[in-house]
Amino acid sequence: KKKEKVKKGSECSEWTWGPCTPSSKDCGMGFREGTCGAQTQRVHCKVPCNWKKEFGADCKYKFESWGACDGSTGTKARQGTLKKARYNAQCQETIRVTKPCTSKTKSKTKAKKGKGKD
């Protein structure tokens, strides 16, 4: 997103800022994008390397078991409840994830794989 020129006299009362995304690797200097109405801004920011090491993923969820296959969409879903968030991460309290319905063997492998990611 490019930084848009702010029209004279227009005042943005509430900017919403996204996460700090390091320019290279998973920590260090990077950029954070902000939006306010039609305006966008990009500012320099820094993800301290010790924070990344301490926290890993920004948002960690505890997931329920996969629901039954929905024949009309060919997908199954499960809900996740927030377990832990990095201190400054604005995580959703609950999320819903879906995946295509597959044969039993494949489903078991995928579910196992996903479980560890909570």
């Epitope: 509430e14 301290p48 968030a85 995580c91 309290e93």
Partner: antibody, heavy 117, light 107 residues
Framework: QVQLVQSGGGLVQPGGSLRLSCAAS????????MNWVRQAPGQGLEWIGM????????ILNQKFKDKATLTVDISKNTAYLQMNSLRAEDTAVYYC??????????WGQGTLVTVSS | EIVLTQSPATLSLSPGERATLSCRAS??????LHWYQQKPGQAPRLLIK???QSISGIPARFSGSGPGTDFTLTISSVEPEDFAVYYC?????????FGGGTKLEIK
């Protein structure tokens, strides 16, 4: 919404110890960072440290590394602050607060600790 | 540690006037800056998070600006109940630190 009720404050002698409690009710206690902050009479706010109930990860202000211990009991939805080797300068109101970057925070009512002989 | 310097230490205004409170960080803290209001005998109350994000239940007259090193809390038209002490706090790095506070008093 989270409600935090604090207890355990009072008068303690220099060199003594005290355990403060912060009991949570309402939304899931275990998902959010619990901060401990203190405020000496007529002074500003000072951060002691924080703990995450889900795994007891603790981040302590180095100033308090030999003074404070943070713990949680998930079964009781309660966070604890253990203060040791108390001195007159530890006299303050101690607050707990539950932090979520998405929704903001909720604070306990505070509990006064007075260190005096 | 990051030092937050608030100014002025005391701000004397009449109800209806505009209040501008400043918080300066000793280094860039992106938008990881929060504003609290505290009244005597009460716990602090969060007014603004992440420099400019509003909080549910907080009147719209409170607004904040940032990010970087210079932050401002603005009260567009001060109400009698706004006279209190205001603190900024950073959550960019450990230890979390607070500014020394600005006391908003009745002129």
């Amino acid at each position: 919404q989270v409600q935090l009720v604090q207890s355990g404050g009072g008068l303690v002698q220099p060199g003594g110890s005290l355990r403060l409690s912060c009991a949570a009710s309402g939304q899931s206690f275990s998902s959010y960072w619990m901060n401990w902050v203190r405020q000496a009479p007529g002074q500003g706010l000072e951060w002691i440290g924080m703990i995450h109930p889900s795994d007891s990860e603790t981040i302590l202000n180095q100033k308090f590394k030999d003074k404070a211990t943070l713990t949680v009991d998930i079964s009781k939805n309660t966070a604890y602050l253990q203060m040791n080797s108390l001195r007159a300068e530890d006299t303050a109101v101690y607050y707990c607060s539950s932090w979520s970057a998405k929704r903001g925070d909720f604070w306990g009512q505070g509990t006064l600790v007075t260190v005096s002989s | 540690e990051i030092v937050l310097t608030q100014s002025p230490a005391t701000l004397s205004l009449s109800p209806g006037e505009r209040a501008t409170l400043s918080c300066r960080a000793s280094e860039s803290i992106s938008n990881n800056l929060h504003w609290y209001q505290q009244k005597p005998g009460q716990a602090p109350r969060l007014l603004i998070k992440y420099a400019s994000q509003s909080i549910s239940g907080i009147p719209a007259r409170f607004s904040g600006s940032g990010p970087g090193t210079d932050f401002t809390l603005t009260i567009s038209s001060v109400e009698p109940e706004d006279f209190a002490v205001y603190y900024c706090q950073q959550s960019n790095s450990w230890p979390l630190t607070f500014g020394g506070g600005t006391k908003l008093e009745i002129k």
